[in-house]
Amino acid sequence: ELQKDSDCCSCHEKWVGYRCNCYFISSEEKTWNESRHFCASQKSSLLQLQNRDELDFMSSSQHFYWIGLSYSEEHTAWLWENGSALSQYLFPSFETFKPKNCIAYNSKGNALDESCETKNRYICKQQLI
Amino acid sequence: ARHCGHCPEEWITYSNSCYYIGKEKRTWAESLLACTSKNSSLLSIDNEEEMKFLTAILTSSWIDVFRDSSHHPWVTINGLTFKHEIKESDHAEHNCAMLHVRGLFSDECGSSKIYHCKHKL
């Protein structure tokens, strides 16, 4: 079975490779902005979720992690860091999120909004292909 | 620098190893065989950094460490003495080791637990 490789390349040291993406799963806590800056310094971005089972490889993690979602007053919508809009199917509860807050997510598929100044763990993501 | 990986689809890569993240439960011996059938080995812990990473993403898993009895030392399936501390339970018959979010613990080899496999690149 080990011969059946995926077509994508592997990730930098201390990053997790899964389904052609690389993830940096922090063990230290930062504010949302500090987390965003750290991910950017790695030429990556805070986690942008494609679907709710994207993190099923770490489904046992107890922690909530900052992800790359913030409210745009200009667009009156929740946007990912690259400017794309949040799918309403990803977080059914997103209408209750306070626009001033930032979003933390756990690998069981739960999201919550918290003050962006709260220190949380965070996940950076790079797409390989 | 990036090197092209050699992990099967649906496995994860981390620091030059591939990991199979199991969802199914097996006894320790069954887990050993299940990993062998995937051309890999039951999860091993090489250092503190790897243990910190694994405990961040996994709830629990059998690891490749056991002992013949409570009077024997903990060894890996390769026969090497295991260096890390394994927290003992009160039960003498708990002779297989597992990784838990709070560290390494002894458990009953015949009980069914989640298992994960590892293959070094």
């Epitope: 965003r36 950017a40 971005s45 400017g83 | -």
Partner: antibody
């Protein structure tokens, strides 16, 4: 804190070895840089080395002549300058990347005071 | 490599007045996946090493007075000193850290008029 040493007067074609002693942060966690400044001129990035020391990059102007290295056990960064030319005359600063892990896409949050290298016959 | 061009080369401003320095990159330093601009500003006083003022184009470094601000995106950036103080006399450099080799602008000397 970063403190450079090893500068001085050297003839064209000669060699020097600069050192930068680091303290106050976990040295091995950060990529480190050398930046130089010719008298009365602007800043020029010279070289970077990863935290582990296994990856380096150099500016084209010094490639093949300058070598960056580090000794994490001594918290020291080095720059070996060979085949020196008059245009290498400058103050050489070591500078710390702001963010840890395997990144070179950083601004510099700490700089040393610099050491002057003069290449003249 | 990305060439950074600063203007003006020098600038004389009265105390309390606004000073504006421009920096243009030969290619965009905006990364599309995170919409971050990989640009920093440094201040260098005579006989001293550079000192970080602004990073990610607009984030002020801790301890830097709020009269310093950075703006711009893509290829065009500005450092503004809203009310020039005597201690702001220095040379100011922009730097891109989007790609290696990392490159600096040629510097802008700010003086009191």
């Amino acid at each position: 804190q970063l403190v450079e040493s090893g500068g001085g007067l050297v003839q064209p074609g000669g060699s020097l070895r600069l050192a930068c002693a680091a303290s106050g942060f976990t040295f091995s966690n950060y990529a480190m840089n050398w930046v130089r400044q010719a008298p009365g001129k602007g800043l020029e990035w010279v070289s970077v080395i990863s935290g582990s020391g296994d990856t380096t990059y150099c500016a084209d102007s010094v490639k093949g002549r300058f070598t960056i290295s580090r000794d994490n056990s001594k918290n020291t960064l080095h720059l070996q300058l060979n085949s020196l030319r008059a245009e290498d005359t400058a103050v050489y600063y070591c500078a710390k990347n702001c963010y840890g892990s395997g990144s070179y896409y950083n601004h510099f949050d700490y700089w040393g005071q610099g050491t002057l290298v003069t290449v003249s016959s | 490599e990305i060439v950074m061009t600063q203007s003006p080369d020098s600038l004389a401003v009265s105390l309390g007045e606004r000073a504006t320095i421009n920096c243009k990159s030969s290619q965009s330093v905006l990364y599309s996946s995170n919409r971050m601009n990989y640009l920093a500003w440094y201040q260098q006083k005579p006989g001293q090493p550079p000192n970080l003022l602004i990073y990610w184009a607009s984030t002020r470094e801790s301890g830097v007075p709020d009269r310093f601000s950075g703006s711009g995106s893509g290829t065009d950036f500005t450092l503004t000193i809203s009310s020039l103080q005597a201690e702001d006399v220095a040379v100011y450099y922009c730097q891109q850290y989007y790609s290696i080799p990392l490159t600096f602008g040629g510097g802008t000397k700010v003086e009191i008029k």
